[in-house]
């Protein structure tokens, strides 16, 4: 079949824009650390890079291959307010490179870490 | 309490970066349209803007207040491959503005649309 060059160009552009790579995301700090329901953070979210995007096949998953850590200072508030906001410094995982990996490899990797 | 200017500056920066606004996201086309498991798209994902980020309170949700539509042409593949890829034209909702809305208002809005 012969396809319009414009269509092929726009499809190629879509591939590039949606590929597996570090992407800026908003992390809800309370959810990320599973804190008590009466503990709140201001701001409630931070911006970090995490692997995201799509892989070319169902059996592949976009995973981080290297990680740095970013230190951010936030205010922690505990309800009822017996004292004012406390500054807390939290280290967040920041994905610096990513790769489409087989879901089986990811599973093996996670389980070998758990077994260690 | 008196807080370090640097800390306040970085917190303000975090607020700005994580606020509710249109963000570029990857949409898995097959999942978005809930198609049959033997229907695939190439590319599998497209890049559009959707509202995202954090609101200042638990009771608020980041919602779109205006939407445009982006037309994209992809290839649809049905397995087993009895014929080649077929072009499909998809009009994707692209959020152009967002607001933190009360979850109750969102619920009412959705249900008033459903009842119409």
């Amino acid at each position: 079949a012969h396809y319009n060059t414009e269509i092929l160009k726009s499809i190629d552009n879509e591939w590039r824009k949606t590929q597996c790579m570090p992407r800026e995301v908003c992390i809800d700090v309370g959810k990320e650390f599973g804190v008590a329901t009466n503990t709140f953070f201001k701001p409630p979210c931070v911006s970090v890079y995490r692997c995201g995007g799509c892989c070319n096949s169902e059996g592949l998953q976009c995973m981080n291959t290297s990680t740095s850590y970013l230190s951010k200072t936030l205010f922690e508030i505990t309800v009822p307010l017996s004292q004012g906001p406390k500054p807390v410094t939290i280290s967040f995982a920041n994905h610096t490179s990513c790769r489409c990996m087989s879901k089986l490899d990811v599973y093996r990797q996670v389980h070998s870490i758990i077994r260690r | 309490a008196h807080y370090n200017t640097e800390i306040l500056k970085s917190i303000d920066n975090e607020w700005r970066k994580t606020q509710c606004m249109p963000r570029e996201v990857c949409i898995d086309v097959g999942k978005e349209f809930g198609v049959a498991t033997n229907t695939f798209f190439k590319p599998p994902c497209v890049s559009v803007y959707r509202c995202g980020g954090c609101c200042n309170s638990e009771g608020l949700q980041c919602m779109n207040t205006s939407t445009s539509y982006l037309s994209k042409t992809l290839f649809e593949i049905t397995v087993p491959l009895s014929q080649g890829p077929k072009p499909v034209t998809i009009s994707f909702a692209n959020h152009t503005s967002c607001r933190c809305m009360s979850k109750l208002d969102v619920y009412r809005q959705v249900h008033s649309i459903i009842r119409r």
Partner: nanobody
Framework: EVQLVESGGGLVQPGGSLRLSCAAS????????MGWYRQAPGKQRELVSA???????LYADSVKGRFTISRDNSKNTVYLQMNSLRAEDTAVYYC????????????WGQGTQVTVSS
């Protein structure tokens, strides 16, 4: 249990129109996505059109400009308006509905026959 019932199929001359509808019963929630596939004799089932509650729509290029998909969330119903019908549109048309959630579910109709012939 969710059930989908299609209607509106039939015999029509080339150039004619039909409106298919598909209604879901058994769910109080509106599906996230709804759409239509078709299967011609001896051929694979192919995607024709789909729509999401977010307003996105999909059309196979073979029907673009001739078919229009629409939905009525209050009735959990999806429609396919088919104009300028051609002989190659002859097929059994199946609707589907997709509910999102932790365990996404798809439901299918039993199919309605569309025959385009003079």
């Amino acid at each position: 249990e969710v059930q989908l019932v299609e209607s509106g199929g039939g015999l029509v001359q080339p150039g004619g129109s039909l409106r298919l509808s598909c209604a879901a019963s058994g769910s109080s929630f509106s599906p996230y996505a709804m759409g239509w596939y078709r299967q011609a004799p001896g051929k694979q089932r192919e995607l024709v059109s789909a729509t999401t509650s977010g307003g996105s729509t999909l059309y196979a290029d073979s029907v673009k400009g001739r078919f229009t998909i629409s939905r009525d969330n209050s009735k959990n119903t999806v429609y396919l308006q088919m104009n300028s019908l051609r002989a190659e549109d002859t097929a059994v048309y199946y609707c589907y509905m997709h509910w999102r959630g932790s365990d996404p579910e798809n439901y299918w109709g039993q199919g309605t026959q569309v025959t385009v012939s003079s």
